[in-house]
Interface confidence: medium
C-alpha cells in the first residue's frame, strides 16, 4: 500500500521568499517575489498526481522546495522505489534518523 | 549524461550587472531544486541562493540578499542569476548545482550535481 | 547562521594511512522532523566540488567504501580508513538543515 506524507520542513530561519498556509505558524518575515500566495493552501500533489507513483514506499511533498520523493520500505530503492536492493545496499538510508 | 553548464560570467566594474546561465540536460530538470555555489579565489565555498522546483520559493544569505535574484526556466532547462550592485567581493567562480531530494530512498537537501564553473571577476 | 568548524584545516597523511576530519556546528543539525542535514564534500585540485557523504553517514552513489560518516548533533566526523593518492584535495563539510545553507571552511588532504 502506498502512503502518503506532506513533509512542511521549512528552512529554519526566515529568509525565505513566500510563506504558505501549510507550514507551521510561525513569524513570517520577506517579500513575497511578486507573487501573493501566502493565503493560497497548496494541494499536496502526493494525493494527486503521484498518489500511486511510489511502488514500495511513501510520497513525501517536501513544500518548501516543492519537490515530490519517495522514502522507500526498507530492501527498496530507486526514484519510484521499484527496485530491490541487494544485501550490502540495505545499510544505506535505512533510517531516517541518520 | 546528467550535466549542468554555467555560462555569462566575466570582467565587471564595481556597481555593474551580470546575468549568469546554467543549462541543465541528462535530467527532469523541473523536478530538482536548484542552486548557486560560489568560491572565492583560494577560498572555501559559499552558498549563494536555491530556488525550489517551480520557482515559487527563493533562498539567499543576507551577503547577497537584495542584489542578486535566481529564477528558472523549466520549459529552457534553464536556471539563472542575476547579479546586480556588484562588489569586489563577489569575485569568485560561480557553480550551478543539483539539489536534492528527488531519486534518493532518504531525500537529503544535498548538491548531487555540480557544474564546472564560470568566472566573476568585479574590478575597477 | 549556523557556523561549520572544521579541524585539521590541512591534513598530510601516508598513502595507505587511515585520515579523519572533525566538523562541529554552532548549534544542533538535527531536523525534529527527518534527520540531520550534514553532508561532505570533496573537491579534487582544479575540479568542482562532489557529493560525498550525505545526512551524516550515507555514501553518495560510486563513493569507494573506505570513506565514512558519523556523528551527530552538533558533533561529526569523516574518516577514510586507507588514504589513496586520488583523494588528495580539499575537503567540505555543509549543513542544509538551517538556512542559510553553510559550509566548513575546508581541509586540505595532501600525500606526506
Known amino acids: 500500500s502506498v502512503r502518503v506524507e506532506q513533509v512542511v520542513k521549512p528552512p529554519q530561519n526566515k529568509t525565505e521568499s513566500e510563506n504558505t498556509s501549510d507550514k507551521p505558524k510561525r513569524k513570517k518575515k520577506g517579500g513575497k517575489n511578486g507573487k501573493n500566495r501566502r493565503n493560497r493552501k497548496k494541494k499536496n500533489p502526493c494525493n494527486a498526481e503521484f498518489q500511486n507513483f511510489c511502488i514500495h514506499g511513501e510520497c513525501k511533498y517536501i513544500e518548501h522546495l516543492e519537490a515530490v520523493t519517495c522514502k522507500c520500505q526498507q530492501e527498496y530503492f530507486g526514484e519510484r522505489c521499484g527496485e530491490k536492493s541487494m544485501k550490502t545496499h540495505s545499510m544505506i538510508d535505512s533510517s531516517l534518523s541518520k | 549524461e546528467v550535466q549542468l553548464v554555467e555560462s555569462g560570467g566575466g570582467l565587471v566594474k564595481p556597481g555593474g550587472s551580470l546575468r549568469l546561465s546554467c543549462a541543465a540536460s541528462?535530467?527532469?530538470?523541473?523536478?530538482?531544486?536548484m542552486s548557486w555555489v560560489r568560491q572565492a579565489p583560494e577560498k572555501g565555498l559559499e552558498w549563494v541562493s536555491t530556488?525550489?522546483?517551480?520557482?515559487?520559493?527563493?533562498y539567499y544569505p543576507d551577503s547577497v540578499k537584495g542584489r542578486f535574484t535566481i529564477s528558472r526556466d523549466n520549459a529552457k532547462n534553464s536556471l539563472y542569476l542575476q547579479m546586480n550592485s556588484l562588489r569586489a567581493e563577489d569575485t569568485a567562480v560561480y557553480y550551478c548545482?543539483?539539489?536534492?531530494?528527488?531519486?534518493?530512498?532518504?531525500?537529503?537537501?544535498?548538491?548531487?550535481?555540480w557544474g564546472q564553473g564560470t568566472t566573476v571577476t568585479v574590478s575597477s | 547562521d549556523v557556523v561549520m568548524t572544521q579541524s585539521p584545516l590541512s591534513l598530510p597523511v601516508t598513502l595507505g594511512d587511515p585520515a579523519s576530519i572533525s566538523c562541529r556546528s554552532s548549534?544542533?543539525?538535527?531536523?525534529?522532523?527527518?534527520?540531520?542535514?550534514l553532508h561532505w564534500y570533496q573537491q579534487r585540485p582544479g575540479q568542482s566540488p562532489k557529493l560525498l557523504i550525505y545526512?551524516?553517514?550515507n555514501r553518495f552513489d560510486g563513493v569507494p567504501d573506505r570513506f565514512s560518516g558519523s556523528g551527530s548533533g552538533t558533533d561529526f566526523t569523516l574518516k577514510i580508513s586507507r588514504v589513496e593518492a586520488e583523494d588528495v584535495g580539499v575537503y567540505y563539510c555543509?549543513?542544509?538543515?538551517?538556512?542559510?545553507?553553510?559550509f566548513g571552511q575546508g581541509t586540505k588532504l595532501e600525500i606526506k
Open positions: 548545482a543539483r539539489q536534492g531530494p528527488i531519486l534518493r530512498k532518504n531525500y537529503y537537501y544535498g548538491m548531487d550535481v
Open positions: 541528462g535530467f527532469t530538470f523541473s523536478s530538482y531544486p
Open positions: 530556488i525550489s522546483t517551480g520557482g515559487t520559493y527563493t
Open positions: 548549534q544542533s543539525l538535527v531536523d525534529g522532523q527527518d534527520g540531520t542535514y
Open positions: 545526512k551524516v553517514s
Open positions: 555543509s549543513q542544509s538543515t538551517h538556512v542559510p545553507y553553510t
